[in-house]
């Protein structure tokens, strides 16, 4: 058995008559020998839940569900109530009526097997009937929602009348119906003016009926309509076997370049037109397994269970249902030499599903892991500014394929045939897995005989130490222009084109900053700034490079304060900026201002 | 607030060494290039080294190229300058000096230590 | 190296009175000049940094000018704290160096 409803509404007038009906409750059946029984909790309850007093007022019929006055409520009996409301005016007070098979203790009221009765309480007398507004003579203040058990048998589940009105008011009629399309699984019954299901609802054909009440009024010559919303909610149950959409229940995946833990091998989709079990029980209830195979794959594959609600299209409305995405995923990274072919099967069990049928499906992964060989090409020729500065990025090295890779660790090292002409320095960069190649020693480029500067490069995979080798020459151009003391050290510093432009800085290619000129739209990514060099610098990214010091690219990189206009980058940096932005490293802060138009005088005043 | 305590000055004969420290409070020394600076008595002001701030680029003045040596261990926030073959003409005030990398001009000066070189 | 010139080398002044210390470079340095100001064992205090900047907390009266080759100090008032020893320094060329310096005496 259950309540139709979780809470419903009347008022409650000072010295109304003790025999007054107030309302019905109505229990559903969830089998067809099922039969109700109400009983009301012992107390009533005020604001916050407050405790009030003993219920020896309200009385209901066990059978009926029909809740009545048995005492009047006066002016006494409701001050004693309010006294004891915490200081709170006594506007509203609750009882809670209980299906009776249900032993739930008096202290919790949770649907489906309790549900509260509130009552609005006026001190005054009950109005004169003239004076109700149809509004008042036909419905509740508060609009009532239903809910109701998809697969159970019909029942009745509302009675539209306002008893206290049709008790006190016998000469006002009052006449409902319902408006509804063709086929709806609803009636009202003229005489009793109750509702009920003619048939079980099925939630997966129809999940919400969105109902008009229709309330026609005759008070003498007078006839007036009033209309409101009657939405019936369907429950769900577990009475849909999972499915493979489309019939696919096999997936092929190749495991290459991507041998990273946590990544995503092959991905198979279940449906489920139910949304129970829910959510927070779910994966508990809804189990996936990888079945025994070899070891190798047990350790190295897991299956993720990712459930995710869907609405579905059912005769012409939407309703919710459940896709299942499951995921097999390493477990663990690959080594290059991995190389193997093998079939999994996956046992997913809807353990709440009774059939008929089964709740069982089995999901099949065929793998294939394949090694992966490293190459470099035979030479890589690059040329360098005799004017660059430290950690200025002149290029890239990088194996075959390595921007695909994940999971794969390939360190990269510079070997010098010159020993006095070691100019450059290499790091891995870990997002792409390749080598970038930047200037560590300008003193060496200032040499003229490390014109031509000749390394090996050498890749190495850190768990295999697999390797290979490439060439290296680079060629050192231009004539060595001695920097400024009086420059920044960053770039980051200078505040203005012309500032930006006649100093180098750390991580110039060029021996010059240069400035990036903002779309001046805001608070925007593409803000005014000097940079070492715009390909690199700002980009939203701290790269490898520019970790290694604070004054190559503090746009990126600062941890420090951002001063003004902007949104941080993540987990550092100026992720957008207003107008200019500029930092000074050494005191960790930016500032990001509108674009100075002032004389420069006042902006050195003003540092 | 910033402070710049330079140590190690003393009486030196002719051809023999010594080593000046200068110790850092107040501002984050790692972040920061440091300079030598000395005063032979009532004489100017003669610039001596530059450190950068993280050691990797040193500059000497002519006159003590080869013979002294700037260093910074910047655990411990500390400046030296390792003074050898020191010359009577080596005998001044040393101050260490800060300077900003955003702004490069010798802003905070230690109160200086004497070096005296004489047989 | 880049030589600096100071002139003159010796100022006599009085209280309240407009004073100018000139400084010229051998060769161009743009802007990176600092003025210092030294009193007897004392270390050398900054006034003036990038050729016309008043450093943080010195006195209003102090101004720079110049770029390139000619530099100037200027006091407008003289006070009578002011009476020391200032000297010029380039930091265009990591050859850092020095003027030799001007005595302001009162007169």
């Known amino acids: 058995l259950y309540f139709s409803r979780d809470a419903y509404w009347e008022k409650l007038y000072v010295d109304q008559a003790a025999g007054t009906p107030l309302l019905y409750v109505h229990a559903l059946r969830d089998a067809p020998e099922e039969v109700p029984s109400f009983r009301l909790g012992q107390h009533l309850y005020g604001t916050y839940r407050t405790r009030l007093h003993e219920n020896n007022w309200i009385c209901i019929q066990e059978d009926t569900g029909l809740l009545y006055l048995n005492r009047s409520l006066d002016h006494s009996s409701w001050e004693k109530l309010s006294v004891r409301n915490r200081g709170f005016p006594l506007l509203t007070v609750y009882l809670k009526v209980f299906l009776s098979p249900t032993s739930l203790r008096e202290g919790e009221c949770q649907w489906p097997g309790c549900a509260r009765v509130y009552f609005s309480f006026f001190n005054t007398s009950f109005p004169a009937c003239s004076s109700l507004k149809p509004r008042e003579l036909c419905f509740p203040e508060t609009r009532p929602s239903f809910r109701i058990r998809e697969n159970r048998p019909p029942g009745t589940f509302h009675q539209f009348r306002l008893l206290p009105v049709q008790f006190l008011c016998p000469n006002i009629s009052v006449a409902y119906r319902l408006l509804e399309g063709e086929g709806l699984p609803f009636r009202c019954a003229p005489d009793s003016l109750e509702v009920s299901t003619r048939w079980a609802l099925d939630r997966e054909q129809r999940e919400k009926y969105e109902l008009v009440a229709v309330c026609t009024v005759h008070a003498g010559a007078r006839e007036e309509v009033v209309m409101v919303p009657f939405p019936v909610t369907v429950y769900d149950e577990d009475d849909s076997a999972p499915t493979f959409p489309a019939g696919v229940d096999t997936a092929s995946a190749v495991v290459e370049f991507k041998r990273k833990e946590d990544t995503v091998v092959a991905t198979l989709r279940v449906f489920d037109a139910d949304v129970v079990p829910a959510s927070g029980e779910l994966v508990r209830r809804y189990t996936s397994t990888l079945l025994p195979g070899d070891t190798w794959a047990q350790q190295t594959f897991r299956v993720e269970h990712w459930p995710n609600e869907t609405s579905v299209q059912a005769n012409g409305s939407f309703v919710r249902a459940t896709v299942h995405d499951y995921r097999l995923v390493l477990n663990r990274n690959l080594s290059i030499s991995e190389n193997r072919t093998m079939q999994l099967a996956v046992l997913v069990n809807d353990s709440d599903f009774q059939g008929p049928g089964a709740g069982v499906l089995l999901l099949h992964f065929n793998v294939s892991v394949l090694p992966v060989s490293l190459h470099l090409p035979s030479t890589y020729s690059l040329s360098v500014s005799r004017r660059a500065r430290r950690f200025a990025q002149i290029g890239k090295v990088c194996v075959e394929n390595c921007q695909a890779f994940s999971g794969i660790n390939v360190q990269y090292k510079l070997h010098s045939s010159g020993a006095n002409c070691s100019t450059l320095g290499v790091v891995t960069s870990a997002e792409d897995t390749s080598g970038i190649l930047f200037v560590n020693d300008t003193k060496a480029l200032r040499r003229p005989k490390c014109a031509e500067l000749h390394y090996m490069v050498v890749a190495t995979d850190q768990q295999t130490s697999r390797q290979a080798q490439a060439q290296l020459l680079v060629t050192v151009e231009g004539s060595y222009v001695a920097e400024e003391a009086g420059c920044p050290l960053s770039c980051a510093v200078s505040k203005r084109r012309l500032e930006c432009e006649e100093c180098g800085g750390l991580g110039s290619p060029t021996g010059r900053c240069e400035w990036r000129q903002g779309d001046g739209k805001g608070i925007t990514r593409n803000f005014s700034t000097c940079s070492p060099s715009t390909k690199t610098c700002p980009d939203g990214h701290c790269d490898v490079v520019e970790t290694q010091d604070i004054n190559i690219c503090p746009q990126d990189c600062l941890r420090g304060s951002i001063v003004g206009g902007h949104e941080p980058g993540e987990p550092r940096g100026i992720k957008a900026g207003y107008g200019t932005c500029n930092c000074f490293p050494e005191e960790e802060k930016c500032f990001c201002e509108p674009e100075d138009i002032q004389d420069p005088l006042c902006d050195e005043l003003c540092r | 607030q910033v402070q710049l305590v330079e140590s190690g000055g003393g009486v030196v004969q002719p051809g023999r060494s010594l080593r000046l420290s200068c110790e850092a409070s107040?501002?984050?020394?790692?972040?920061?290039?440091m300079h030598w600076v000395r005063q032979a008595p009532g004489k100017g002001l003669d610039w001596v080294s530059t450190i950068y701030y993280d050691g990797s680029d040193e500059y000497y003045s002519d006159s003590v190229k080869g013979r002294f040596t700037i260093s910074r261990d910047n655990s411990k926030n500390t400046l030296y300058l390792q003074m050898n073959s020191l010359r009577a003409e080596d005998t001044a005030v040393y101050y260490c000096?800060?300077?900003?990398?955003?702004?490069?001009?010798?802003?905070?000066w230690g109160q200086g230590t004497l070096v005296t070189v004489s047989s | 190296d880049i030589q600096m010139t100071q002139s003159p080398s010796t100022l006599s002044a009085s209280v309240g009175d407009r004073v100018t210390i000139t400084c010229r470079a051998s060769?161009?340095?743009?802007?990176?000049l600092t003025w210092y100001q030294q009193k007897p064992g004392k270390a050398p205090k900054v006034l003036i940094y990038k050729a016309s900047t008043l450093e943080r907390g010195v006195p209003s009266r102090f101004s720079g000018s110049g770029s390139g080759t000619e530099f100037t100090l200027t006091i407008s008032s003289l006070q009578p704290e002011d009476f020391a020893t200032y000297y010029c320094h380039q930091y265009s060329s990591y050859s850092y160096t020095f003027g030799q310096g001007t005595k302001l005496e009162i007169k």
């Open positions: 000096a800060r300077d900003p990398p955003s702004f490069r001009y010798f802003d905070y």
């Open positions: 107040g501002f984050t020394f790692r972040n920061y290039g």
């Open positions: 060769q161009s340095i743009r802007s990176w």
